[in-house]
């Protein structure tokens, strides 16, 4: 008699997730020296045990302890570049900027990036059919408690000037739904955190506009101002050459406005 | 370039209400706070007040029931408002600029402008 | 409010000297510190922010250093310019306040 398997809303783990996660283990520790003395192995298991048997739905930030614990790493605590639906532009400017870190330039992040994954309560069988979907199922699945937990961490980490790159195409440039409005956000510590600054940035050619002058903007310069942060706000309006001028700063077209 | 001009009556009567502007150029008032401060002759530096780039304010505590910091963004101008003056008022009043987007400290000064308050 | 206390009051001394200017906050002000340079009839002009952060234009000889409640303000061999009036200001709670001031002038 087949078992009856839940049914989620969402897409199932990624294929090979295991191998997937062990491979990028490998290479990160491989490519990062100060990352050497990590045990790949107990890094899957931990981050295995955080999921398998349990009830996608009763995930737990404590969970995840034993991963974090073994993924514990520094980075420079100045130099961190949070991000909102412009993943892609963040991580092309941290492969330029290389002193500058995403969460996805650490381990754990750059361990979990685009994948998902989940198990099964009372089975040790990775579910790879559905898993749960944040908006529809339940948000504290493996994939959204994982993504909160380092988030969190990360941003606990930061410290003076902290930079954040947010989406200029959207409707909402600051989305307090967003895991930087909800998480990141609320756990800079102003005690350490001196200034956010934003980056906007803009999609279309032609747009001049100060996006800087958005209402969602503004509820994100209030929010920050009102737990002791400094906020600063700044347009690209060009990211095409925003990019080209943090690869070449001598250029002389990068002294212009971007 | 930035710049950052007070203007107003260099004598105000005790119990008056002293009247200053703060005229911008170079950037504008949608975009940054501007602060009021204060120094008597040959003292120091005293914080008046803030009105940030939405058009919120904050004040000193010890000067909050006689302030009021307003503006004018499309004449890029900035006010501030003393009342029932004394004596002790009489400083070298300055607008400046935040740093940064909401800034507490100022990159970009006025010249100053003294007030006398006397009968 | 936050008490800032500016020490000494006056310094009278040559050019080519080191300066060591101190600032102590009644509390902690986690590094929310400006230093300001004053001129006779000038506005103030800033310095260094944020403890350590030189503000473009001012020279390298300036450096500010400190954290919790104790920081120094440090010219590293004065020149005929920099006579002058100093305040540390801190900028971790409103009212915003600055210290009283300490004056560096010619020996």
């Known amino acids: 008699v087949p078992r009856w398997r839940q049914q989620w809303s969402g897409p199932g783990t990624t294929k090979r997730f295991p191998e997937t996660v062990l491979a990028r283990c490998v290479k990160y520790t491989e490519i990062h020296p100060e990352m050497r003395h990590v045990d790949c192995q107990s890094v899957w298991d931990a981050f295995k045990g955080a999921f398998i048997s349990k009830h996608p739905c009763n995930i737990t930030e404590e969970d995840y302890q034993p991963l974090m614990k073994l993924g514990t790493q520094t980075v420079p605590c100045n130099k961190i570049l949070l991000w909102s639906r412009i993943k892609d532009l963040a991580h092309q400017f941290t492969q330029v900027q290389r002193d500058m870190f995403t969460l996805e330039d650490t381990l754990l992040g750059y361990l979990a990036d685009d994948l998902t994954w989940c198990g099964e309560f009372n089975t040790s069988k990775i579910n790879y059919q559905s898993c749960p979907d944040w908006r529809k199922d339940c948000s504290n699945n493996p994939v959204s408690v994982f993504w909160k937990t380092v988030s969190r961490r990360f941003a606990e980490a930061a410290c003076d000037v902290v930079h954040v790159m947010l989406n200029g195409s959207r409707s909402k440039i600051f989305d307090k739904n967003s895991t930087f409005g909800s998480v990141e956000v609320h756990n800079l510590q102003p005690e350490k955190v001196q200034t956010l600054e934003a980056w906007v940035i803009h999609g279309g050619r032609e747009d001049s506009r100060d996006l800087c002058q958005d209402p969602t903007i503004k509820e994100l310069e209030s929010i920050i101002s009102k737990r002791n942060i400094q906020f600063s706000c700044k347009n690209i309006y060009r990211p095409d050459k925003f990019l080209q001028c943090v690869k070449n700063p001598e250029d002389s077209s990068c002294t212009s406005e971007i | 370039q930035v710049q950052l001009q007070e203007s107003g009556p260099g004598l105000v009567k005790p119990s008056e209400t002293l009247s200053l502007t703060c005229t911008v150029s170079?950037?504008?008032?949608?975009?940054?706070?501007i602060h009021w401060i204060r120094q008597p002759p040959g003292k120091g530096l005293e914080w008046i007040g803030v009105?940030?780039?939405?058009?919120?304010?904050d004040y000193n505590p010890s000067l909050k029931s006689r302030v009021t910091i307003s503006k004018d963004n499309s004449k890029s101008q900035v006010s501030l408002k003393l009342s029932s003056v004394t004596a002790a008022d009489t400083a070298v009043y300055y607008c400046?600029?935040?740093?940064?987007?909401?800034?507490?400290?100022?990159?970009?000064w006025g010249q100053g402008t003294l007030v006398t308050v006397s009968s | 409010e936050i008490v800032m206390t500016q020490s000494p009051p006056t310094l009278s001394l040559s050019p080519g000297e080191r300066v060591t200017l101190s600032c102590r906050a009644s509390?902690?002000?986690?590094?929310?510190l400006v230093w300001y340079q004053q001129k006779p009839g000038q506005a103030p002009r800033l310095l260094i922010s944020?403890?350590?952060s030189l503000e473009t234009s001012i020279p390298a000889r300036f450096s500010g250093s400190g954290s919790g409640t104790d920081y120094t303000l440090t010219i590293s061999s004065l020149q005929p310019e920099d006579f002058a009036v100093y305040y540390c200001?801190?900028?971790?709670?409103?009212?915003?306040?600055f210290g009283q001031g300490t004056k560096v002038e010619i020996k």
């Open positions: 400046a600029k935040g740093k940064v987007t909401t800034g507490f400290y100022f990159d970009f």
């Open positions: 170079g950037f504008s008032l949608t975009s940054y706070g």
């Open positions: 009105i940030w780039r939405g058009g919120s304010t």
């Open positions: 509390e902690d002000i986690y590094n929310r």
């Open positions: 944020g403890v350590t």
């Open positions: 200001q801190q900028y971790w709670s409103t009212p915003y306040t």
